[in-house]
Interface confidence: low
């Protein structure tokens, strides 16, 4: 592969737990500047697999509230704005990186931690098993 | 509001960027411990609304590799199996945080940022717009 | 039921200076981390400034540093935001919000208040 050189300007890594610490700035860069949130905001009431965003807040982590969903029905909503039983609202989930303050309650201390979270549903065709 | 007690063995924060500039583990902390990525992903095939992976990968991110999302067609997949151009497959977005090499090439040293990934697809019921 | 209404907004010409308010009702306000944020016409959703809840803490993001700064008063319950040396490129609605801004929902919005930097 392609090796990139060591940018001579990098702080010192003298830290005994390099490279496991590293420095991390939290003034957060928003590459999403061409995106309108709110373009995709009603989604979760316009969908055959309508959820609810649940809040899910923890002030030892960062960021301190994510956002949850919950699927409305187990079925799939139809044409004639019933529920179709025979397909099935499922979350779709993905995992995320977060901060973890740790030692716990320290301002500029966090560890990376992975979480799944739900980020919307989606209607399936279910998997049907066949009893002999 | 609740204010929670300093740790006192938190690290110093002497230095003068604090507390926008902390000290984070990348010894990841895994909380999905009891979840089974597996079952979730033939999602994107049963989908009434679709969607292909494609990989991203960037060197100078952590995570360097990131899934998108791109639905595979512009309405849902009908019980005949067919595309119904009446419903719209549209893509569930979120902002994660990711860590960007800042300077660039450093091992060390990253900058927060945040990007919008498409997770999957969804199908919704289109918003027509009437001319009068 | 929660209510955030700004004000301050107007035409201004480049240099000019704007303070903009947000008055909050409905919650404890002190106990909330608060958000300046705008829409420029035909763009996304930018955020602008944040403060913590007890006003120790204030972020920028890199575009208006040195030249907006946010405040708050918690026995008014008001968000402000004082811009100096607007440019053309700060024309937008900016809306205070109560909530995380990440992801992409916040709990709750005001209804926004028009700059526009213009000569």
């Known amino acids: 592969g392609i090796t990139i050189p060591r940018n001579p300007g990098c702080p010192n890594s003298e830290d005994k737990n390099f490279p496991r610490t590293v420095m991390v700035n939290l003034n957060i860069h928003n590459r999403n500047t061409n995106t309108n949130p709110k373009r995709s905001s009603d989604y979760y009431n316009r969908s055959t697999s309508p959820w609810n965003l649940h809040r899910n807040e923890d002030p030892e982590r960062y960021p301190s509230v994510i956002w949850e969903a919950k699927c409305r029905h187990l079925g799939c909503i139809n044409a004639d704005g019933n529920v179709d039983y025979h397909m099935n609202s499922v979350p779709i989930q993905q995992e995320i990186l977060v901060l973890r303050r740790e030692p716990p309650h320290c301002p500029n201390s966090f560890r990376l931690e992975k979480i799944l979270v739900s980020v919307g549903c989606t209607c399936v065709t279910p998997i049907v098993h066949h009893v002999a | 509001g609740i204010t929670i007690p300093r740790n006192p063995g938190c690290p110093n924060s002497e230095d003068k960027n604090f507390p926008r500039t902390v000290m984070v583990n990348l010894n990841i902390h895994n909380r999905n411990t009891n979840t089974n990525p597996k079952r979730s992903s033939d999602y994107y095939n049963r989908s009434t609304s679709p969607w292909n992976l494609h990989r991203n990968e960037d060197p100078e991110r952590y995570p360097s590799v990131i899934w998108e999302a791109k639905c595979r067609h512009l309405g849902c997949i009908n019980a005949d199996g067919n595309v119904d151009y009446h419903m719209n497959s549209v893509p569930i977005q979120q902002e994660i945080l990711v860590l960007r090499r800042e300077p660039p090439h450093c091992p060390n040293s990253f900058r927060l940022e945040k990007i919008l990934v498409s997770v999957g697809c969804t199908c919704v019921t289109p918003i027509v717009h009437h001319v009068a | 039921q929660v209510q955030l209404v700004e004000s301050g907004g107007g035409l201004v010409q480049p240099g000019g200076s704007l303070r903009l308010s947000c008055a909050a009702s409905g919650f404890t306000f002190s106990s909330y981390g608060m958000y300046w944020v705008r829409q420029a016409p035909g763009k996304g959703l930018e955020w602008v400034a944040k403060i913590e809840q007890d006003g120790s803490e204030e972020y920028y993001v890199d575009s208006v540093k040195g030249r907006f700064t946010i405040s708050r008063d918690n026995a008014k319950n008001s968000l402000y935001l004082q811009m100096n040396s607007l440019r053309a490129e700060d024309t937008a609605v900016y809306y205070c919000?109560?909530?995380?801004?990440?992801?992409?929902?916040?709990?709750?919005w005001g209804q926004g208040t028009l700059v526009t930097v213009s000569s």
């Open positions: 919000a109560k909530g995380e801004i990440l992801p992409l929902y916040f709990d709750y």
